[in-house]
C-alpha cells in the first residue's frame, strides 16, 4: 500500500531537497525560505530567487519552509506553573519548562503542568526526580506508598492494596479489636 501523501508533501517530493514546486507552475522548483523567514512571493522562474521576508517580532519559523505567514510565539502557561526557559526568537519558539525541583506532568502531547518533586519523607529515593517524571520512593517499614508519598500503616484500611505491605500492623489492629469483644 502506498501511504497517502498530503498535497504539500506530494508537491515537495517532486523537487530536490530545500526546494518546493511552484503552486502555479509545476515545472518550476523554488528555493525554500530559511528558518526565521516566510514566503512572500514564489520565485518567478527557474534559477530565480524566492522572495522571503523576515518574521516579525513575536513570530517565528523553526525550519526551512514555504509558509505564507510566520507562526505566533507560544506563551508559557503560568496557571500550569510553567516558566520561560528561553524567549522566542524569529527562528525558534519560546521554550517553557518548570522550576528547580519540579517535574512536568503531561495532560496531553503539548500541555504539561509543573508539580513539586516528592521528597520521600518516611522513605528513601529509589529514582531521582527527572524532567518528566516524579521521584520514585521506597517506604520505610511501617509505611506504605500512596500517590507517591509514604503514609503510616495506621492509615491502612483492610480493603486497600496496602494490607500486603502493612500485614503485621493490620494483624495487630485486628487482634486488638477481637480482644475487645465478649
Amino acid at each position: 500500500l502506498v501511504p497517502h501523501l498530503g498535497d504539500r508533501e506530494k508537491r515537495d517530493s517532486v523537487c530536490p531537497q530545500g526546494k518546493y514546486i511552484h503552486p502555479q507552475n509545476n515545472s518550476i522548483c523554488c528555493t525554500k525560505c530559511h528558518k526565521g523567514t516566510y514566503l512572500y512571493n514564489d520565485c518567478p522562474g527557474p534559477g530565480q530567487d524566492t522572495d522571503c521576508r523576515e518574521c516579525e517580532s513575536g513570530s517565528f519559523t523553526a525550519s526551512e519552509n514555504h509558509l505564507r505567514h510566520c507562526l505566533s510565539c507560544s506563551k508559557c502557561r503560568k496557571e500550569m506553573g510553567q516558566v520561560e526557559i528561553s524567549s522566542c526568537t524569529v527562528d525558534r519558539d519560546t521554550v517553557c519548562g518548570c522550576r528547580k525541583n519540579q517535574y512536568r506532568h503531561y495532560w496531553s502531547e503539548n500541555l504539561f503542568q509543573c508539580f513539586n518533586c516528592s521528597l520521600c519523607l518516611n522513605g528513601t529515593v529509589h529514582l531521582s526526580c527527572q524532567e518528566k517524571q516524579n521521584t520514585v520512593c521506597t517506604c520505610h517499614a511501617g509505611f506504605f506508598l500512596r500517590e507517591n508519598e509514604c503514609v503510616s500503616c495506621s492509615n491502612c484500611k483492610k480493603s486497600l492494596e496496602c494490607t500486603k505491605l502493612c500485614l503485621p500492623q493490620i494483624e495487630n489492629v485486628k487482634g486488638t479489636e477481637d480482644s475487645g469483644t465478649t
Epitope: 530559511h34 523576515e54 517580532s57 524567549s87 527562528d91 525558534r92
Partner: nanobody, 114 residues
Framework: QVQLQESGGGLVQSGGSLRLSCRAS????????MSWYRQAPGKKRELVAG???????NYADSVKGRFTISRDNAKNTVYLQMSSLKPEDTAVYYC????????WGQGTQVTVSS
C-alpha cells in the same frame, strides 16, 4: 535604528587568513539569525554563511571547510573567520540581519593577491 558595522577587511596573500567582525545595534541581537554575504566586481551578491540563534550554521559550498561563522550575543557581534583564502574570495563582504532582511552593513573590502 538598526545598524550593522563591519570591520577586519584588508589585503592578504593567497593561503592567508582574515577575521571579519560585524557589530550590531538597534535590535535584540540574540533574537535574530545573522549572515555574511559577498559581492565580487561585476557579480551578484551571494550568501557566504549564516548563523541561527541556536548557533547552528550553514555555508556556501565554495567556502565550506575554510570559513567559520560565529556569534557573541554578549558583544552583539558576528564574526567570519576566513582561512586558506583564494584570489576568487576577493570581494566586498557584507553583514546582514537574518538572510533576507533589509538591514545590511556598509561592507568591508577583502582582497586576496596571488
Amino acid at each position: 535604528q538598526v545598524q550593522l558595522q563591519e570591520s577586519g577587511g584588508g589585503l592578504v596573500q593567497s593561503g592567508g587568513s582574515l577575521r571579519l567582525s560585524c557589530r550590531a545595534s538597534g535590535f535584540t541581537f540574540s533574537h535574530y539569525p545573522m549572515s555574511w554575504y559577498r559581492q565580487a566586481p561585476g557579480k551578484k551578491r551571494e550568501l557566504v554563511a549564516g548563523i541561527y540563534t541556536d548557533g547552528s550554521t550553514n555555508y556556501a559550498d565554495s567556502v565550506k571547510g575554510r570559513f567559520t561563522i560565529s556569534r557573541d550575543n554578549a558583544k552583539n557581534t558576528v564574526y567570519l573567520q576566513m582561512s586558506s583564502l583564494k584570489p576568487e574570495d576577493t570581494a566586498v563582504y557584507y553583514c546582514r540581519r537574518s538572510m533576507v532582511s533589509v538591514y545590511w552593513g556598509q561592507g568591508t573590502q577583502v582582497t586576496v593577491s596571488s
